[in-house]
Amino acid sequence: APVPPGEDSKDVAAPHRQPLTSSERIDKQIRYILDGISALRKETCNKSNMCESSKEALAENNLNLPKMAEKDGCFQSGFNEETCLVKIITGLLEFEVYLEYLQNRFESSEEQARAVQMSTKVLIQFLQKKAKNLDAITTPDPTTNASLLTKLQAQNQWLQDMTTHLILRSFKEFLQSSLRALRQM
């Protein structure tokens, strides 16, 4: 039954739609996370001048943020669905430690930071269902992640602000590339 009995007139259920496909839902999930990143970037850019800073290279040395490269098969030239999907999932798994770092970095957007972290976990689950070659996906080492987190949290205030900015920018770029690639699959 589309609507249970006792439906009141102001509470009419939404009309039946075609069920969401895997590709549609993954697309929506990535856009959900991108909107979350925009909200977090707004707070970061309002709080400090990091978004206009030219000293990014100083902080970037400490970070090994996932990036799409030609060999990953996600670009139009040399596109390879399976290789690309493995890269997207591996990259998202590598971003998780950085998203954990972000959790204590926001005052007024604490809930949004949590939502970005959790929605990324959900995206990984959705993509893993889609992937045929799960063996090729390497999971980051928890011990390495723990020491990286400690190192990042021990940085001075300026570097922490810059790290936050760089994580959000890189994650946004990675997701945008992923979105473009997934739309070709």
Partner: nanobody, 131 residues
């Protein structure tokens, strides 16, 4: 055929516990925000709990807060409603529903207990709390 199926209802004594499950056929439950609703005889249907598909956040009506827990297992494509410390006033037919209320970042969580946010409904399972 697209449908939702609830299970786990039954007769339980006041203070007891019961666990409801919601599964889908014809579509992937993991892709939808899920709400549990209930309707007692002669009363309006009310939303009791919901869980997002986007970030797994949850929402509870005041009447069940601290007693009911909603959760989901995306691997099993199932949503659960664990009901503890049940009271006679919890007696009702319990429905699960699936909708897309949670796909926009910054969605209002409390909207998820409004029935118009849902596309698919189950047939319901009876829960009776009585000694």
């Amino acid at each position: 055929q697209v449908q939702l199926v609830e299970s786990g209802g039954g007769l339980v004594q006041p203070g007891g516990s019961l666990g409801l499950s919601c599964a889908a056929s014809g579509f992937t439950l993991a892709y939808y925000g899920i709400g549990w609703f209930r309707q007692a005889p002669g009363k309006e249907r009310e939303g009791v709990a919901c869980i997002s598909s986007s970030d797994l956040s949850t929402y509870y009506a005041d009447s069940v807060k601290g007693r009911f827990t909603i959760s989901r297992d995306n691997a099993k494509d199932t949503v659960y409603l664990q009901m503890n410390s049940l009271k006679p006033e919890d007696t009702a037919v319990y429905y699960c529903a699936a909708g897309t209320w949670d796909l926009k970042f910054g969605y209002s969580r409390s909207n998820c207990v409004r029935s118009y946010e849902y596309d698919y409904w189950g047939q319901g399972t009876q829960v009776t709390v009585s000694s």
